[in-house]
Amino acid sequence: TQHGIRLPLRSGLGGAPLGLRLPRETDEEPEEPGRRGSFVEMVDNLRGKSGQGYYVEMTVGSPPQTLNILVDTGSSNFAVGAAPHPFLHRYYQRQLSSTYRDLRKGVYVPYTQGKWEGELGTDLVSIPHGPNVTVRANIAAITESDKFFINGSNWEGILGLAYAEIARPDDSLEPFFDSLVKQTHVPNLFSLQLCGAGFPLNQSEVLASVGGSMIIGGIDHSLYTGSLWYTPIRREWYYEVIIVRVEINGQDLKMDCKEYNYDKSIVDSGTTNLRLPKKVFEAAVKSIKAASSTEKFPDGFWLGEQLVCWQAGTTPWNIFPVISLYLMGEVTNQSFRITILPQQYLRPVEDVATSQDDCYKFAISQSSTGTVMGAVIMEGFYVVFDRARKRIGFAVSACHVHDEFRTAAVEGPFVTLDMEDCGYNIPQTDESTLMT
């Protein structure tokens, strides 16, 4: 988990599909009641921006203490600031909660850069703009941290929505969503619509603007266009998926598909960028550079260090290619593709001294821990985390940023053989060899 890249770390038109579309079987199967339709009370319940994370309002304790909590599908702890910190406007005060229970256990979470540590306990938790339920959940009360909280981000904690396998200190600490499903009738599914602004937001604009929606327990039709296409969750730890092909402006990168998933591919709302394994990153950048060769940008731009600026309103989106990721489908030998625009992978940033320029950072970066489909990917799509059926759905987001010529797309089906071979099997430590 890297700070600045991984947070903390860590109106759309549907595209016409190429090839034959399955008869909407991925979108119209019978579902459990309450999982589909309108969730008005949860729409627009997220705020924030891709560079600093999207957060939801939650309440903790009795009487309820209101906090803004980063929505993170790349971790599994519910952890909140519980001591004064220069970047926190407010924090969880356990001593004021009559329902707080101390678990008498510490937790320490180091990142590549930075860390947080705290004390474990449980308390009553609810989501004001979520399902009308209260659950007793595990909470890590953060007492010390380094490079975790972000100045001006307006969130005070993190909601890890992934599986128990990656919870700290170990998988016996039940994650929040597991507790929610176990203690209520909320279906085992949530969906995210992250809405990138397409331009930099200052502090007051972030507070006033809508950042998107987290629909807990269902799917809201108003948040997407076209069909939902599902990819299997390969293993329940991170939200791990399998990428089977990558194209830049329709040109296949032609790599062994194992490279795309080395050592895993995950969907992570707590990461800003699309992060790619070294070899894949180098090939992708080479291809993007070639496609946009009418302009020469500094090497530092492609490494995420330098900005590129145009005079306001003159960004030549058309010189940058679209990027397509093909994901394993639910049917044998069938895949589908999700396509993002430069409006997703060029991240708008505030210029240091002038509002005359539109400036951008290249939001694709190199990874040593596999592919991370972060906010820049998710901002193009409505993403359904269907835990009950062990699958993740993608549809074109109704709020994705695009222009009059191109739109993000989710298209299929495509015939792809031997997709199972694209998954990388991380070597498991043989416990017996440690017993010497």
């Epitope: 020469k296 500094p298 090497d299 530092g300 330098q306 600026c309 005079q311 240091v352």
Partner: nanobody, 129 residues
Framework: QVQLQESGGGTVQAGGSLRLSCAAS????????MGWFRQAPGKEREEVAS??????????AASVKGRFTSSQDNANNTVTVYLQMNSLKPEDTAIYYC????????????????????WGQGTQVTVSS
């Protein structure tokens, strides 16, 4: 407008050292990104080092890593960047240019080359065998 002036070039024997300097004035932003480039006769210009003031980081081309080091001085509204070149080889012979981006941003409409808006005149480095 950022002004760049290189100095320190010359002729040196293989294995010898030279120190180039680039004085930059006229920055409008606190942060800056600068690059050292070189161009040998009949070859394309290549970046040999780049400096990012915000990150306090320097990157080097593989061909010079371990032999060239860059450092910087900030005084009196002028930034001076140095390129210390050790263990020089005949293939290091080229015109060396200093380039800069104000605010660590390449402003496309200002023009420039190789992703930099501002360029010095260049200084000749010749390494004889």
């Amino acid at each position: 407008q950022v002004q760049l002036q290189e100095s320190g070039g010359g002729t040196v024997q293989a294995g010898g050292s030279l120190r180039l300097s680039c004085a930059a004035s006229g920055y409008t932003y606190r942060s800056y990104c600068m690059g050292w480039f070189r161009q040998a006769p009949g070859k394309e210009r290549e970046e040999v080092a780049s400096i990012n003031s915000d990150q306090g980081s320097t990157r080097y081309a593989a061909s010079v890593k371990g032999r060239f080091t860059s450092s910087q001085d900030n005084a009196n509204n002028t930034v001076t960047v140095y390129l210390q070149m050790n263990s020089l080889k005949p293939e290091d012979t080229a015109i060396y240019y200093c380039a800069a981006n104000d605010g660590c941003a390449y402003r496309v409409y200002r023009g420039g080359a190789y992703g930099y808006n501002f360029w010095g005149q260049g200084t000749q480095v010749t390494v004889s065998s």
